[in-house]
């Protein structure tokens, strides 16, 4: 969380951003909130990016003002216009690109004053893993698959019964480049698994950490997965 204060002029307002990550090819949100003003027309929102000459986005007098918008963001940005009045200056970024990573500034002007806060935005690819029993294999084998990751992640297997055990000798992980030549499909196979145990496939890079769990018993198979972004720090 980054909290910024205006320094020019008599009054400053509090602006708060949260570092976040964007998933390549999907829509992302750059989070920013501020001390609200009572009239929408008194609020100006400017999003800027370090190293980019034009604006990322500008909202003033109750509507988007995109005449100064940089070409790389053309047609890809929007604020939540109905929430600006309650202090939400967050920016929706469509079709996130690898090159969207960097330092952004959320700059706010209201009738009370000015304020800004920076936001670190990372980009990459991350997806939920799915763990299945591989019935085609000669021995009891688990297969963990996740369709899109970038940068290349690490994959670690763990087991509830054999806590702390190192499964690197009995697992094999491969990374297959996807058709857009950036993201990769992750496939990891774990051999010699035992019944009545819960196994976890953990995939992690510097942006996200995802876990797929599978519990195999004689009567049923239970699966669970979750994904966590690693750099959600507020400013």
């Amino acid at each position: 969380l980054i909290i910024g204060f205006g320094i020019s002029g008599r009054h400053s307002i509090t602006v708060t951003t949260v570092a976040s990550a964007g998933n390549i090819g999907e829509d992302g949100i750059l989070s920013c909130t501020f001390e609200p003003d009572i009239k929408l027309s008194d609020i100006v929102i400017q999003w800027l990016k370090e190293g980019v000459l034009g604006l990322v986005h500008e909202f003033k007098e109750g509507k988007d003002e995109l005449s100064e918008q940089d070409e790389m963001f053309r047609g890809r940005t929007a604020v939540f216009a109905d929430q600006v009045i309650v202090g939400n200056a967050s920016l929706r970024l469509k079709n996130v690109q690898l090159t969207d990573a960097g330092t952004y500034k959320c700059y706010i002007i209201t009738s009370k004053g000015k304020g800004n806060a920076n936001l670190e935005y990372k980009t990459g690819a991350f997806s939920m893993p799915e763990v299945n029993v591989d019935y085609n294999a000669s021995s009891e084998t688990l297969r963990c698959e996740a369709p899109r990751w970038f940068p290349q992640p690490t994959v670690v297997w763990a087991s509830q019964v054999d806590q702390g055990a190192n499964f690197s000798e009995v697992s094999n992980t491969s990374f297959e480049l996807n058709s857009e030549n950036v993201t990769m499909k992750v496939v990891s196979v774990l051999y010699n698994v035992t019944i009545n145990n819960t196994y976890s496939c953990m995939i992690e890079n510097d942006i996200a950490k995802a876990t797929g769990d599978i519990k195999v018993t004689e009567s049923e198979i239970k699966r669970r997965s979750h994904l966590q972004l690693l750099n959600s720090k507020a400013s």
Epitope: I38, K39, G62, D82, V84, V86, G87
Partner: antibody
Framework: QVQLQESGPELVKPGASVKLSCKAS????????IHWLKQSPGQGLEWIGW????????HYNDKFKGKATMTADKSSTTAYMQLSSLTSEDSAVFFC???????????????WGQGTLVTVSA | DIVMSQSPSSLAVSVGEKVTMSCKSS????????????LAWYQQKPGQSPKLLIY???TWESGVPDRFIGSGSGTDFTLTVSSVKAEDLAVYYC?????????FGAGTKLEIK
């Protein structure tokens, strides 16, 4: 139709806290601000602040910062206001009201609850 | 904070009469960007919660009888009841939402003779 149902009257001791509720129905709870106001014989109508249940954002009148805390529960479409360190000055009727339709301002206040009487007395 | 001053504090009129009440603000409520006055009028009947009558100084809230007329601009505003009915017995408040914190007048109490 839009309705705001407030909790019943409260008799509380000085120094204690009280939590008032405002149950909203008849509209999308997360799309509008809920405001709290105080009405006392000495001070008339005073605006305490608003909460936007969609995000949890709040905005307070400086006069009530530290005295009032507004929260909202989306699942039950209920807004709450806790008043702390109560004194006789806090004895009043408290209203919740829904913010306006426009995205250009959260006012005026077109829908009001029936009010909750809070009496602070030893 | 913007101070709202209402006058008179109370007045008594007969049914059918016309009545006017005044509201003055300590600074202009006319916003140059949209040429709107950020002022509302509320009616509060005995034992009830306030009810919105007028906003933007002169726009009727849905369902409000047209005998209630809001007028004025800048710092001086008026609420007129063209032909008072017995049910209009209430306190009338003006309210500015031009700047935070929004503030209310002390009210004008309308009594029926």
């Amino acid at each position: 139709q839009v309705q705001l149902q407030e909790s019943g009257p409260e008799l509380v001791k000085p120094g204690a806290s009280v939590k008032l509720s405002c149950k909203a129905s008849g509209y999308i709870f997360t799309d509008y601000t809920i405001h709290w106001l105080k009405q006392s014989p000495g001070q008339g109508l005073e605006w305490i602040g608003w909460i936007y249940p969609g995000s949890g954002h709040t905005h307070y009148n400086d006069k009530f910062k530290g005295k009032a805390t507004m929260t909202a529960d989306k699942s039950s479409t209920t807004a709450y206001m806790q008043l702390s360190s109560l004194t006789s000055e806090d004895s009043a009727v408290f209203f919740c009201a829904r913010g306006g339709e426009s995205i250009t301002t959260v006012f005026p206040l077109a829908y009001w609850g029936q009010g909750t009487l809070v009496t602070v007395s030893a | 904070d913007i101070v709202m001053s209402q006058s008179p504090s109370s007045l008594a009129v007969s049914v059918g009469e016309k009545v006017t009440m005044s509201c003055k603000s300590s600074q202009s409520l006319l916003y140059s960007s949209d040429q709107k006055n950020y002022l509302a009028w509320y009616q509060q009947k005995p034992g009830q919660s306030p009810k919105l009558l007028i906003y933007w100084a002169s726009t009727w809230e849905s369902g409000v009888p047209d005998r209630f007329i809001g007028s004025g601009s800048g710092t001086d505003f008026t609420l007129t009841v063209s032909s008072v009915k017995a049910e209009d017995l209430a306190v009338y408040y003006c309210h500015q939402y031009y700047s935070y914190p929004p503030t209310f007048g002390a009210g004008t109490k309308l009594e029926i003779k």
